[in-house]
Amino acid sequence: AESCTSRPHITVVEGEPFYLKHCSCSLAHEIETTTKSWYKSSGSQEHVELNPRSSSRIALHDCVLEFWPVELNDTGSYFFQMKNYTQKWKLNVIRRNKHSCFTERQVTSKIVEVKKFFQITCENSYYQTLVNSTSLYKNCKKLLLENNKNPTIKKNAEFEDQGYYSCVHFLHHNGKLFNITKTFNITIVEDRSNIVPVLLGPKLNHVAVELGKNVRLNCSALLNEEDVIYWMFGEENGSDPNIHEEKEMRIMTPEGKWHASKVLRIENIGESNLNVLYNCTVASTGGTDTKSFILVRKADMADIPGHVFTR
């Protein structure tokens, strides 16, 4: 069922079908006998009770006040009253733009990131049973789409998709043809969510070790979901059975990015593990960044400046 009209201030375009639905609808069915009234006041005018006799354009149903169509002089305040329940709306009817297929003041703006999923579906659940056909226009040019009941665009966004998309529903009521237009201003922007991945800590790390012992080299980065973090060492990774890449750990940050950590475990350190580069790389669509570790025998650490020590 169509949800009730909860917004207290509503702007609509002249010449289109429009409805107000009060928000105690389920309650109203329970108390069928209760008197339910709709009122309008505009400017200094007192409340005027609305009924089908007050205008051929107005229809009253259980929970709904319908306009066929709404016109400029329908601007004003509307009230629904039932027992001790009252709901009020302020309705502003604006002029249709005669030179365009849509009215600029009645446009919903959406920002879509390039390559992200982009969807426009032309639906109108309230008038669904009365709609004969629906057309989708881009910048007021009709798009040729297969489904003329609910035209839909579903794709990965491209910059060329930017523009004004208007869903126009054509419907009949009491022998007259009406249309309802819903327009979206779609702006395609670059992927704003991507950060340049950052490897945490110094770019070059000398690690003091003892032969025969084990060491864990921790590489941490702040990165995007798609970014990869990996270790490179030796001629061909995996040639040394004493070197193991541990499973990557990822924690999502409050900003929706990822804090990743990948440990390289070197067991039973031998001479061949000393003074060689163990590189940790983070790669993204923006490029790569690398951090290097060098294992140095504890006795040799005296030759290295203090600020490059890592333990």
Partner: antibody, heavy 115, light 113 residues
């Protein structure tokens, strides 16, 4: 729209150097790396290396290490690829491409190395 | 380096028929941390730069007809053209972007039977 515009064709002598430019427009240059890919006549695609437009970090294919240099000029959103000590087997169309899967390509620059 | 091997080297298919190109990587390009396959497919016509068709192994690039689809995971991948059109005649390449150097397959030449 998003595009990469490359410099024109070149004819070089063996031992010489070449420098191809690739000007980006329609997107934020520093958000994407630029890869260079070459294609010898009638052959497949060979990745030469790439550069991060954000921080200038480079990563080159092993076989070109020492002969190739990739640079960027963020003020003009332009990437450059220089290849030195040219040989006849460097004759190829050189492409610049965006990102790590290459969604935008330049039209290519034909470089002919001949004595 | 990760070696990409395509099969077959060339393929002749009738118009309207299905075309299938395979690509095998020498090591997995599936990243367990995000379950993404770092594999792309390109189409190249004579005298033109390659054109991206598929990335993340199965995501179709915007503007690419839906007769093109990508599948597979780990080391084995497939590009399928469900109903071959005349304009699909080209060389097709797979490429891994999991580890540098980013390597391409040798290419598969697709022709009309």
């Amino acid at each position: 729209q998003v595009q990469l515009v490359q410099s024109g064709a070149e004819v070089k002598k063996p031992g010489a150097s070449m420098k191809v430019s690739c000007k980006a427009s329609g997107y934020t240059f520093t958000n994407f790396g630029i890869s260079w890919v070459r294609q010898a006549p009638g052959q497949g695609l060979e990745w030469m290396g790439w550069i991060s437009a954000y921080n200038g970090n480079t990563n080159y294919a092993q076989k070109l290490q020492g002969r190739v240099t990739m640079t960027t000029d963020t003020s003009t959103s332009t990437a450059y690829m220089e290849l030195r000590s040219l040989r006849s087997d460097d004759t190829a169309v050189y492409y610049c491409a965006r990102g790590w899967f290459f969604d935008i390509w330049g039209r290519g620059t034909l470089v002919t190395v001949s004595s | 380096d990760i070696v990409m091997t395509q099969s077959p080297d060339s393929l002749a298919v009738s118009l309207g028929e299905r075309a299938t190109i395979n690509c095998k990587s020498s090591q997995s390009v599936l990243y367990s941390s995000n379950n993404k396959n770092y594999l792309a497919w390109y189409q190249q016509k004579p005298g033109q730069p390659p054109k991206l068709l598929i990335y993340w192994a199965s995501t179709r690039e915007s503007g690419v007809p839906d007769r093109f689809s990508g599948s597979g995971s780990g080391t084995d991948f497939t590009l399928t053209i469900s109903s071959l059109q005349a304009e699909d005649v080209a060389v097709y390449y797979c490429q891994q972007y999991y580890r540098t150097p980013y390597t391409f397959g040798q290419g598969t030449k697709l022709e009309i039977k």
